[in-house]
């Protein structure tokens, strides 16, 4: 069995998680892609997905999550803006390919969000570098209801710093002006 590896990101409240999921260009360019959260012992839950077929570099926004699929580069960009402590958890990118099971893109993301120190540079959104306007043309796509049972056969060990995201927290509020402090990124 494939070992499910994780990459860990430690960010402060108000910052932005900015990750890129690589995929095989020829195989998956126009396939619908999704961002999921995985809770221990549960099926992965889809939080946002691209349109079907996926449109090139067309931002899709669901609450505080923005997906951009760059077909020409085999790259799905995922941003979670204005992070909250409750966003901590384990995430993954997947490619929907009905009728087959979703294809998981490695690695999984272990996100740990901690409280910022008010007024301290670097700890909150006021210390960031770039103000981004989410284009008004962003779309909310409908995501398939099914998820792959294969991806939950063995949940990875939970990080001690992990805080599970309650279901109620998935109803993310819309953001029109965001300030980005990516992990890069």
């Amino acid at each position: 069995a494939t070992k499910l590896t994780e990459e860990k990101y430690e960010l402060k409240e108000g910052q932005t998680l900015d990750v890129k999921c690589d995929y095989t260009l020829e195989k998956f360019a126009s396939s619908q892609k999704a961002w999921q959260i995985i809770r221990d012992g549960e099926m992965p839950k889809t939080l946002a997905c691209t349109e079907r077929p996926s449109k090139n570099s067309h931002p899709v926004q669901v609450g505080r999550i923005i997906l951009e699929d760059y077909h020409d580069h085999g790259l799905l960009r995922v941003r979670m803006v204005n992070l909250q402590v409750e966003d901590s958890g384990l995430y993954q990118c997947v490619i929907y390919q009905p009728p087959k099971e979703p294809h998981m893109l490695f690695d999984r993301i272990r996100l740990v969000v901690t409280k910022g120190f008010s007024g301290t540079p670097g700890s909150n959104e006021n210390s960031t570098q770039n103000v981004y306007k989410i284009p008004p043309t962003t779309t909310k796509a409908l995501c398939p209801l099914y998820t792959s049972p294969r991806t939950v056969t063995q949940a990875p060990p939970k990080s001690t710093a992990d805080v599970s995201t309650p279901d109620s927290e998935i109803n993310l509020t819309n953001v029109t002006d965001i300030i980005r402090v990516p992990v890069f990124n």
Epitope: E10, V19, H73, L75, F106, D107, I109
Partner: antibody, heavy 126, light 107 residues
Framework: QVQLVQSGAEVKKPGSSVKVSCKTS????????VSWVRQAPGQGLEWMGG????????DYAQKFQGRVTITADASTSTGYMELSSLRSEDTAVYYC???????????????????WGQGTTVTVSS | DIQMTQSPTSLSASVGDRVTITCRAS??????LAWYQQKPEKAPKSLIY???SLQSGVPSRFSGSGSGTDFTLTISSLQPEDFATYYC?????????FGQGTKLEIK
């Protein structure tokens, strides 16, 4: 093998602007990252900002916000860093650094600054 | 901003010695740490990324370890060409920040 070639040394007056270029070859420019780092005489390294051409927008260190503009021209695989309102403290060697896109196992995009240009000396003096 | 503190600031050693340089982050940065080597009048050179991964072409005598807030760069057996200044850098979150540098000199 990725190579970076920066533009030549510049001498500028206080209050003016300087634009340094960084031409890359041998890498996937559009989906890689170009960062700019400076080093004042006898001092350490200071990250100024970076850009991933396909995303279009750059990110800057707060210290330089409003004075620095980082751009990229994918057609020529060239990155640019323009610093305005120059003062004597801006006298430094300016480096571009290229982060080739690593496909596959890792999400983290702005990896370590893998390949560096030779540096461009900018002297600000009246 | 995340502060990166290197120690020692300077270090004298001999060829063949084993040398360790440490870098501490003011907050957790997972494994998003890089090490660079810089010689006088030259551009920095990348040695290690992701705390412990060796950049292509870098000799295996260089190694990195650590995660969270504490990291080390080890040179197992110093060679004459290793005398230089070494910098650590975090890239967990913007703005990326460097340590102040460790100057490695010949004893």
């Amino acid at each position: 093998q990725v190579q970076l070639v920066q533009s030549g040394a510049e001498v500028k007056k206080p209050g003016s602007s300087v634009k340094v270029s960084c031409k890359t070859s041998g890498g996937t420019f559009s989906s890689s990252a170009v960062s700019w780092v400076r080093q004042a005489p006898g001092q350490g390294l200071e990250w100024m900002g970076g850009i991933t051409p396909i995303f279009g927008t750059a990110d800057y260190a707060q210290k330089f916000q409003g004075r620095v503009t980082i751009t990229a021209d994918a057609s020529t695989s060239t990155g640019y860093m323009e610093l305005s309102s120059l003062r004597s403290e801006d006298t430094a060697v300016y480096y571009c650094a290229f982060t080739p896109r690593y496909r596959g196992s890792s999400h983290h995009y702005y990896y370590a600054l893998g390949v560096w240009g030779q540096g461009t000396t900018v002297t600000v003096s009246s | 901003d995340i502060q990166m503190t290197q120690s020692p600031t300077s270090l004298s050693a001999s060829v063949g010695d084993r040398v360790t340089i440490t870098c501490r982050a003011s907050q957790g940065i997972s494994s998003w740490l890089a090490w660079y080597q810089q010689k006088p009048e030259k551009a920095p050179k990348s040695l290690i990324y992701a705390a412990s991964s060796l950049q292509s072409g870098v000799p295996s005598r260089f190694s990195g370890s650590g995660s969270g807030t504490d990291f080390t760069l080890t040179i197992s057996s110093l060679q004459p060409e290793d005398f230089a200044t070494y910098y650590c850098q975090q890239y967990n979150s913007y703005p990326y920040t460097f340590g102040q540098g460790t100057k490695l000199e010949i004893k």
